[in-house]
């Protein structure tokens, strides 16, 4: 039975040219995290494997940095980065947990962080 929940940074906004940290946290489970995948609309951004460490997709190497923790840092943001991001936690024995973050990249300097929310 899957008892865990994923807490994410929720709906967030950031300025064009700036950077943002995408973070998810898995709680309420003792399951072992074997791998975390970060994806944007079915496109792989990065993988953090418990044994093999971090891997950033070649097409994002210049603008994506691993961490902090199991999170992901997006740099040199463009308006095209606006959209949904998913953290996919592969765990044993529970299975897969998915968290969703919506990022809006703004032209102006009016960029505020949204509230945190949970996905069971």
């Amino acid at each position: 039975m899957m008892t865990g929940t994923i807490e994410t940074t929720g709906n967030i906004s950031a300025e064009k040219g700036g950077s943002i940290i995408l973070q998810c946290h898995l709680s309420s489970t003792t399951a072992q995290v074997t791998q975390v995948n970060w994806e944007q609309q079915d496109q792989l951004l990065a993988i953090c494997n418990a044994d093999l460490g971090w891997h950033i997709s070649p097409s994002f190497k210049d603008r994506v940095a691993p961490g902090p923790g199991l999170g992901l840092t997006l740099q040199s943001l463009t308006v095209n980065d606006t959209g949904e991001y998913f953290c996919i936690y592969h765990t044993y024995p529970d299975g897969t947990y998915t968290g969703r973050i919506f990022l809006e990249v703004l032209e102006s300097s009016v960029a505020e962080h949204g509230a945190r929310f949970q996905i069971p």
Epitope: T34, D42, L52, H55, S57, P58
Partner: antibody, heavy 122, light 107 residues
Framework: QVQLVQSGAEVKKPGASVKVSCKAS????????MSWVRQAPGQGLEWMGI????????SYAQKFQGRVTMTRDTSTSTVYMELSSLRSEDTAVYYC???????????????WGQGTTVTVSS | DIQMTQSPSSLSASVGDRVTITCRAS??????LNWYQQKPGKAPKLLIY???SLQSGVPSRFSGSGSGTDFTLTISSLQPEDFATYYC?????????FGGGTKVEIK
């Protein structure tokens, strides 16, 4: 050209260990992950584990955990797979295989060694 | 571990036939699926990676499709050199498990 050359056939007794080598040439050795895959006679392919030749990090299939050790020697561009406590069921052809893309998650294996036959028999 | 199930385990076909092999994963693997061809006494050969991308040098009669849990390898017009065993493999999560194989034989 890109090539993986494995060591020769081995015959071992049950309980012994075997160390198979895989020498890479024709590419930047540390940029590509290397997997080990085995195939028992008349059976399918079985993934054993993977090593990152750059840092030496490894991931092993649970079935082989505690019995298998994968290492590399960057000075000779060689990876090694050692399997201990051999039993008759370990009789198989052992292949090393290179990940198809450099410095990235190992999507598929595009270059394979010729295979090393390991026979375990008393 | 992710289980990969191939079907059929064997099939008989004639030169020129269209051949379809399926592979099912026990959980979603997105597009992290590879197909290999193996001939007796030889090492496997990568045909398709990332579910549908053709490996360099592989004839265009081979194609792959699918996403999630269900995948297909299609040979549009079977050639004499295509009689072999085909394996799928997932590369989403370690261990990178293989399917049991499909042997394509001459009818």
């Amino acid at each position: 050209q890109v090539q993986l050359v494995q060591s020769g056939a081995e015959v071992k007794k049950p309980g012994a260990s075997v160390k198979v080598s895989c020498k890479a040439s024709g590419y930047t050795f540390t940029s590509y992950y290397m997997s080990w895959v085995r195939q028992a006679p008349g059976q399918g392919l079985e993934w054993m584990g993977i090593i990152n030749p750059s840092g030496g990090s490894t991931s092993y299939a649970q079935k082989f955990q505690g019995r298998v050790t994968m290492t590399r020697d960057t000075s000779t561009s060689t990876v090694y797979m050692e399997l201990s406590s051999l039993r008759s069921e370990d009789t198989a052809v052992y292949y090393c295989a290179r990940a198809r893309y450099p410095s990235s998650w190992p999507y598929g294996m595009d270059v394979w060694g010729q295979g090393t036959t390991v026979t375990v028999s008393s | 571990d992710i289980q990969m199930t191939q079907s059929p385990s064997s099939l008989s076909a004639s030169v020129g036939d269209r051949v379809t092999i399926t592979c099912r994963a026990s959980q979603s693997i997105n597009s992290y699926l590879n197909w290999y061809q193996q001939k007796p006494g030889k090492a496997p050969k990568l045909l398709i990676y990332a579910a549908s991308s053709l490996q360099s040098g592989v004839p265009s009669r081979f194609s792959g499709s699918g996403s999630g849990t269900d995948f297909t390898l299609t040979i549009s017009s079977l050639q004499p050199e295509d009689f072999a065993t085909y394996y799928c493999q997932q590369s989403l999560l370690t261990p990178f498990t293989f399917g049991g194989g499909t042997k394509v034989e001459i009818k």
